[in-house]
């Protein structure tokens, strides 16, 4: 008598999530009499997937009519496949009895589920960094299968190389996650720059998914400060200008100090944007030279985006050089960021 064979012809089957999977199984003999059951996994923890005789298996149907005389095809179809259905499926022949006795198992068919990765989510640093510093961006995508996946980073269309990528878990799983970190060197020109995380996977048919982050969220461009004096007016008033240039973001507070005392405080708002995304701002202060007997120390103090204040100081020299009265000549910049501006007293 020929020994019963349980034949599972496919060692593996791959199905897209949402589709149906057909798991084939035939037996070589009708004898002995007894049922076929399908299990996922082996050993004491195996799960019953289909038993024609009893149980409710709403997603599983027999491919052939199992009640038909001389039926030797016990293939099944599982509908609406999800990643959780992945595993090795065994077609098992039992001999009829009380209880039925397990006789022979097929070699097993490994079902793998192709699942699309989720849209990549890119997150940047929690706090802004200044130009010439390196910041890290992370990109995450989840729920894909099989494990093979490609992730690339781009900054303004150029691929980044300082990248570390991990796919978890390391071994076989129903689905996988990818997490990648890219280190990006910021420059003063990066306000309008963008980083893109691009994920390619077999389920995407060559149309990769992209996640983006704007460097404007991560960068701080500190301002340049320039203090100049306009021509002295006939009424002995000196017009002093503090030019604050090339800064980002717009959040900026400027304070004028006269001899250490607050003269005026201004907040930047609704500034026009430069081509590179930075901002400029100019503030004027009129100093009445005739009202002062001694030299006046003026300070332009700028607090940008919550950072420590930056000062630019200079002195208006009263009656020191009457011959230079009304001149437009700026003095040498001293080591203490001071300008000496000479004016005559009335």
């Amino acid at each position: 008598e020929e020994e019963l064979q349980v034949i599972q012809p496919e060692k593996s089957v791959s199905v897209a999530a949402g589709d149906s999977a057909t798991l084939n199984c035939t037996v070589s003999s009708l004898i002995p009499v007894g049922p076929i059951q399908w299990f996922r996994g082996a050993g004491p923890g195996r799960e019953l997937i289909y038993n024609l005789k009893e149980g409710h298996f709403p997603r599983v149907t027999a491919v052939s009519d199992p009640t038909k005389r001389n039926n030797m095809d016990f293939s099944i179809r599982i509908s609406n496949i999800t990643p959780a259905d992945a595993g090795t499926y065994y077609c098992v022949k039992f001999r009829k009895g009380s209880p039925d006795v397990e006789l022979k198992s097929g070699a097993g068919t490994e079902l793998s589920v192709r699942a699309k990765p989720s849209a990549p989510v890119v997150s940047g640093p929690a706090v802004r960094a200044t130009a010439e510093h390196t910041v890290s961006f992370t990109c995450e995508s989840h729920g894909f299968s099989p494990r093979d996946i490609t992730l690339k980073w781009f900054k303004n269309g150029n691929e980044l190389s300082d990248v570390q990528t991990n796919v978890d878990p390391a071994g076989k799983s129903v689905s996988y996650s990818i997490r990648s970190t890219a280190r990006v060197l910021l420059t003063r020109r990066d306000v309008h720059s963008q980083v893109i995380c691009e994920v390619a996977h077999v389920t995407l048919q060559g149309d990769p998914l992209r996640g983006t982050a704007n460097l404007s969220e991560a960068i701080r461009v500190p301002p340049f400060l320039e203090v100049t004096q306009q021509s002295m007016r006939a009424d002995n008033q000196v017009n002093v200008t503090c030019q604050v240039t090339k800064f980002y973001p717009q959040r900026l507070q400027l304070t004028w100090l006269e001899n250490g005392n607050v003269s005026r405080t201004e907040m930047a708002s609704a500034l026009p944007e430069n081509k590179d995304g930075t901002y400029n701002w100019t503030s004027w202060l009129l100093v009445n030279v005739s009202a002062h007997r001694d030299d006046v120390k003026l300070t332009c103090q700028v607090e940008h985006d919550g950072q420590p204040a930056v000062n630019k100081s200079f002195s208006v020299k009263v009656s020191a050089h009457p011959k230079e009265q009304g001149s437009n000549t700026a003095a040498e910049n001293t080591g203490t960021n001071e300008r000496n501006i000479y004016g005559g007293s009335g």
Partner: antibody, heavy 122, light 112 residues
Framework: QVQLQESGPGLVKPSETLSLTCTVS????????WSWIRQPPGKGLEWIGF???????FYQSSLKSRVTISLDTSKNQFSLKMTSVTAADTAVYYC????????????????WGQGTTVTVSS | DIVMTQSPLSLPVTPGEPASISCRSS???????????LDWYLQRPGQSPQLLIY???SRASGVPDRFSGSGSGTDFTLKISRVEAEDVGVFYC?????????FGQGTKVEIK
Amino acid sequence: QVQLQESGPGLVKPSETLSLTCTVSGGSIRDYYWSWIRQPPGKGLEWIGFIYYNGRTFYQSSLKSRVTISLDTSKNQFSLKMTSVTAADTAVYYCARVRAYSGIGLDGTDVWGQGTTVTVSS
Amino acid sequence: DIVMTQSPLSLPVTPGEPASISCRSSQSLLYSTGYTYLDWYLQRPGQSPQLLIYGGSSRASGVPDRFSGSGSGTDFTLKISRVEAEDVGVFYCGQALQTPLTFGQGTKVEIK
């Protein structure tokens, strides 16, 4: 090549909870049973229990009320928690992989960790 | 629970000579599929156990062919055709038919 590494405290006080973790490297959690086995000093092997990749657990009946085995597939780790320990729980604890190819039984405990010594003492 | 009983518990051996260890189970380990759920392990001094034989007679990967397993039902034998010095340690049989998995008491093999 699959390797297993046990980690956890070497000294536990009586009545407290013993917690051990086994990290699986170089291979997959799926399709295997993940077992804890212990060996008291100078004695033989005692199976504590195992967990299948699908989350189903099986325990030694004498320890069932005190033991929990759990699986973290994202970290490729499985863990043992044993409550209300006594001096009788002093042993070398091994984590191990058990194979299952088909049928109802198992096909050998083929990969073992190096073992971690746990002493229960105040 | 299935009880596993080994004999002898101690086995002095001479290198180059054969050796044999017996294992008996309290119920048959031959399943209806024809598979025998009996394994043999060796625990060398200071080391973890290693799988030698599974399924009653199949050698595990990397195990020398001087080790062989035989038997069916409830009586099993592990044979070493020519003992080598590295074979010293404690040999355990274990059943994998049903939970709880159980092991024999162990047979300590030492050089005479």
